[in-house]
């Protein structure tokens, strides 16, 4: 799916209509880029408790085990994106797979990552006729990590 | 940093002119989203051994040490991606920080991430004066994640 | 118009630290998209990329010997530098400085566009 | 790594033949660059992006291929085109620049 701009344009760029209207099929194809989750959201169920799985996907298994949670946004590009939301303050004991060991604990791993907004373009708002994207940073929790606490200096 | 687009386009969308030529400075302003991984990268020589440390961030505190590695694509947005590289087969313990626990695996959690490439459009490679924005999913490592090895039923 | 120029000593021996500089003009390394390589031939024998800096100061280098190498820009003179340590007779070549950073319509090349002439080292006790 | 294999590493043509030289990678790339050069000289672009001409390079010049193939065409060669010539790619990662082993044309 692309998106088709023409050279030098003064927002980068500037664009013309070639029939009255897209249809939302058009910009939703574009926009929907990626609907899963690093791991496949028909395992999660595994992974909804405090316990590391010895089966199922990454984030069952890890023991600092995590569930994915969607956030969906139809002006957004990508449309979906999903937050990883821990399931133990404490990373579960290797041996066992559900006692917690306080030596460890399991945090959240945040990324940054770029995404395009559709917006109305800047003093155009009565138009109805251009959209722009707009680029931002947009905060997300990627995984559940297990690290050692932080011994302040 | 905004994309103009003009509503009801044929490719999603077709785009005009404004001035003769676009300066590098404007398409790498668009594209150079985001250019940290999602730890920073002036802590990273503290990950480059296989052993959890007691200070710095993630990716060193994190019993499955990573490092992370530049993919740099000036054609592409994110024109900066980072992938997460393992620096032990298996977790580290909890209690020391440097030996090695045959229990667990350290693996890496990979995700395909929308990006878009900066391309002639299709059938116009002569014009010189568009180019297409082309989305893709692009497979990147985003941390490693210390895991109970599989069993298989 | 764009010029690049390699200096650096002709003879070394083994063990020693090579430094070679490539002085150039016609256009600025702190242009957004700009990047400056080093490559080099050894007699008869093909082309080697070693290293590469970028306008924003990232640098790459070839893996196989990324210990042994060091790239840096001083944007102000125009130059980069490259340091080669430890070298030793394989790494007699001629080394060639290269810029890469032409936008076309469709997005950045990632050829070189501009080379010098090369300077020819020989590493031999 | 991405190795790219150039095909033959010597060739030798007359005046007037239609050469084509093949560069393949190890794995599949974007777009390819060709370089031709002389004994004594640094290399001089001939092909941008697997087809696009360098600037001052006859049309007798041309580049096609896509995926691991890819392919240098001389349509008649003239007596300035004896040289060698090399395919070179770019992997965004880890960023790494590749050349071809070169191919040597020779006057037959």
């Known amino acids: 799916v692309s998106l088709r701009i023409q050279e030098g344009c003064s927002h980068l760029p500037s664009c013309c209509p070639s029939k009255e209207q897209e249809p939302p099929e058009e910009w939703l194809k574009w926009s929907s880029a990626s609907v899963s989750p690093p791991e496949p959201l028909s395992h999660t169920h595994h992974a909804e408790s405090c316990r590391a799985s010895k089966d199922g996907p990454l984030n069952s298994r890890a023991i600092s085990p995590w569930s994915y949670e969607l956030d969906r946004d139809l002006n957004r590009v990508p449309q979906d994106l999903y937050h990883a939301r821990c399931l133990c303050p404490h990373c579960v004991s290797l041996q066992t797979g559900s006692h917690m060991d306080p030596l460890g604990n399991s945090v959240p791993l945040y990324h940054n990552q770029t995404v395009f907004y559709r917006r109305p373009c800047h003093g155009e708002e009565g138009t109805h006729r251009r959209y722009c994207l707009e680029r931002r940073l947009y905060r997300v929790s990627l995984a559940c990590v297990c690290v050692r606490p932080r011994v302040m200096a | 940093v905004s994309l103009r687009i003009q509503e009801g386009c044929s490719h999603l969308p077709s785009c005009c002119p404004s001035k003769e030529q676009e300066p590098p400075e404007e398409w790498l302003k668009w594209s150079s989203a985001s250019v940290s991984p999602p730890e920073p990268l002036s802590h990273t020589h503290h990950a480059e051994s296989c052993r959890a440390s007691k200070d710095g961030p993630l990716n060193s505190r994190a019993i499955s040490p990573w490092s992370y590695e530049l993919d740099r694509d000036l054609n592409r947005v994110p024109q900066d991606l980072y992938h997460a590289r393992c620096l032990c087969p298996h977790c580290v313990s909890l209690q020391t920080g440097s030996h090695m626990d045959p229990l667990g695996n350290s693996v890496p959690l990979y995700h395909n991430q929308t990006v878009f490439y900066r391309r002639p459009c299709h059938g116009e490679e002569g014009t010189h004066r568009r180019y297409c924005l082309e989305r893709r999913l692009y497979r990147v490592s985003l941390a490693c994640v210390c895991v109970r090895p599989r069993v298989m039923a | 118009q764009v010029t690049l120029r390699e200096s650096g000593p002709a003879l070394l021996k083994p063990t020693q630290t090579l430094t070679l500089t490539c002085t150039f003009s016609?256009?600025?390394?702190?242009?957004?998209?700009?990047?400056l390589g080093w490559i080099r031939q050894p007699p008869g024998k093909a082309l080697e990329w070693l290293a590469h800096?970028?306008?924003?100061?990232?640098?790459h280098y070839k893996p196989a010997l990324k210990s042994r190498l060091t790239i840096s820009k001083d944007t102000s003179k125009n130059q980069v530098v490259l340091t080669i340590t430890n070298v030793d007779p394989v790494d007699t070549a001629t080394y060639y400085c290269?810029?890469?950073?032409?936008?076309?319509?469709?997005?950045?090349?990632?050829?070189?566009?501009?080379w010098g002439q090369g300077t020819l080292v020989t590493v031999s006790s | 790594d991405i190795q790219l294999t150039q095909s033959p590493s010597f060739l030798s043509a007359s005046v007037g033949d239609r050469v084509t030289i093949t560069c393949s990678a190890s794995?599949?790339?974007?777009?390819m660059y060709w370089y031709q050069q002389k004994p004594g000289k640094a290399p001089k672009p001939l092909i941008y992006?697997?087809?696009n001409l360098a600037s001052g390079v006859p049309s007798r010049f041309s580049g096609s291929g896509s995926g691991t193939e890819y392919t240098l065409t001389i349509s008649s060669m003239q007596p300035e085109d004896f040289a060698t010539y090399y395919c070179q790619l770019y992997h965004s990662y880890p960023p790494t620049w590749t050349f071809g082993q070169g191919t040597k044309l020779e006057i037959k």
């Open positions: 290269a810029r890469m950073g032409q936008l076309h319509y469709y997005g950045y090349d990632y050829a070189m566009d501009y």
């Open positions: 794995s599949s790339v974007s777009y």
């Open positions: 016609g256009f600025s390394l702190s242009t957004s998209g700009m990047g």
């Open positions: 800096i970028w306008w924003d100061d990232v640098k």
């Open positions: 992006r697997t087809s």
